[in-house]
């Protein structure tokens, strides 16, 4: 990394987590010194180039879409920046996961699903015939992995005290440590609705 | 399944315009760059235009900068090749292609071509 | 610009045989060569890109190789259906160029 520069930014414009088969877009921040923008994917250590796009574009933030998501696919990702014939910058990295190579988690909840505010509630992802060592719980809509992971089996996933910005579908995924990026399909839905007292009645009469 | 079909060639004179079109589908047409490719006479590929996938940015050969102007509709999935002042040197099977989300300059899938020949 | 010459421009050979096809550059491109194919009735094919990169879905029978300014396209075990014709082009800098094509025949 040159300098004292801030570091570019590396994200997808939609989720990071995606299912075998699908596609993401993934952008690079632009560097205004660099003549080409290189997509680079980390596997052991190593960095092998999957995407370039050439200075052309000005200064528009470097795309790359990724099509046909598969494990090959799913890892590390950063944008590497020649600035020089041996002179290069990175951004950060990005982490894709690929869903559905492996059968699907159940989701449950220790109690009904609309909260009000302040209150608990606790979400189980288990799996009766997959051995998983790993959980993780997702919220739809989210543009980055989810933040919820257990080990434990089942996995107890505690939210709260709630807020306003809780409510959403949730789902979860398991997977094995020695393959990080490669998780299961999606379990079955569970929709959080958290509200305060003035909308208690529009929420129980829907 | 991508499906790319060009229309609007023809017979031109000399000097004359035309517009080709290229109608794309099966995939999200605007994450993708696309470009103009064509086949001459004698068999050979010339890189002919490219749009950038937002529609903001074009780039041209030096052959046919300043007469062609490529354009696109991301609402309407197409493609446009506006040709004028065009030379005998023109004539060839033009072919519409999808640009890789991953690379420039690298083209994945085809169309059929549209055939424009210039001739008094 | 970059000027590709391809060679040779017309090859037959049977089926089960190993062919390979040549592209030179004016100048060093680095890795960043692509093959293409052209079947009558077909859209063109992209091969493989990068040199060396196969694309999805494309037979592992095709194969390329090289750097710099040279770069080879194998294709083994040869099957009726690769008569075609084959075409390189530079990806390393504007203005992408091809080279002049190969017509494949199947004896």
């Known amino acids: 990394q040159e300098g004292d520069f801030p570091m570019p930014f590396i994200s997808a414009k939609s989720s990071p987590v995606i299912p075998l088969d699908g596609s993401v877009k993934i952008q690079c921040q632009a560097i205004r010194e660099a003549y080409l923008t290189q997509l680079m994917i980390i596997k052991n250590s190593t960095y092998r180039e999957i995407g370039r796009r050439l200075k052309f574009w000005n200064e528009t933030d470097p795309e790359f879409v990724i099509d046909h998501m598969d494990a090959n696919k799913a890892g590390r990702y950063q944008c590497q920046y020649r600035i020089g014939h041996y002179r290069f910058r990175y951004s950060d990295t990005l982490e894709l996961v690929v869903t559905g190579l492996y059968g699907k988690p159940f989701l449950s909840a220790d109690r009904g699903l609309v909260l009000m505010p302040g209150e608990n509630i606790s979400l189980t992802c288990s799996s009766a015939h997959i051995p998983f060592d790993r959980f993780s719980l997702a919220k739809e809509g989210e543009l980055s992995l989810p933040q919820h992971q257990s080990g434990e089996h089942p996995a107890n996933f505690s939210l709260g005290p709630v807020d306003l910005n809780v409510s959403g579908i949730y789902r979860c995924y398991g997977w094995y440590n020695r393959s990080p990026y490669l998780w299961s399909f999606p379990s079955n839905a569970l929709e959080l609705v958290v509200t305060d007292s003035i909308h208690q009645d529009y929420t129980t009469q829907n | 399944e991508v499906q790319l079909v060009e229309s609007g060639g023809g017979l031109v004179k000399p000097g004359g315009s035309l517009k080709l079109s290229c109608a794309a589908s099966?995939?999200?047409?605007?994450?993708?760059?696309m470009s103009w490719v064509r086949q001459t006479p004698d068999k050979r590929l010339e890189w002919v235009a490219t749009?950038?996938?937002?529609?903001?940015?074009?780039y041209y050969p030096d052959n046919v900068k300043g007469r062609f102007t490529i354009s696109r509709d991301n609402a309407k999935n197409n493609l446009y090749l506006q040709m004028s002042s065009l030379r005998s040197e023109d004539t060839a099977m033009y072919y519409c292609?999808?640009?890789?989300?991953?690379?420039?300059?690298?083209?994945?899938?085809w169309g059929q071509g549209t055939t424009l020949t210039v001739s008094s | 610009d970059v000027q590709i010459t391809q060679s040779p421009s017309y090859l037959a050979a049977s089926p089960g045989e190993t062919i390979t096809i040549n592209c030179r550059a004016s100048?060093?491109?680095?890795?960043?060569l692509a093959w293409y194919q052209e079947k009558p009735g077909k859209t063109n094919m992209l091969l493989i890109y990068?040199?060396?990169t196969l694309q999805s879905g494309v037979p592992s029978r095709f194969s390329g190789s090289g750097s710099g300014t040279d770069f080879t396209l194998t294709i083994s075990s040869l099957e009726p259906e690769d008569l075609a014709m084959y075409y390189c082009?530079?990806?390393?800098?504007?203005?992408?160029?091809f080279g002049g094509g190969t017509k494949l025949e199947i004896k």
């Open positions: 292609a999808r640009e890789t989300g991953l690379y420039d300059g690298l083209f994945d899938f």
């Open positions: 099966g995939f999200t047409f605007s994450n993708y760059g």
């Open positions: 749009m950038h996938s937002g529609g903001t940015y074009t």
């Open positions: 100048k060093t491109i680095s890795k960043y």
């Open positions: 990068s040199g060396s």
């Open positions: 082009q530079q990806h390393d800098e504007y203005p992408w160029t």
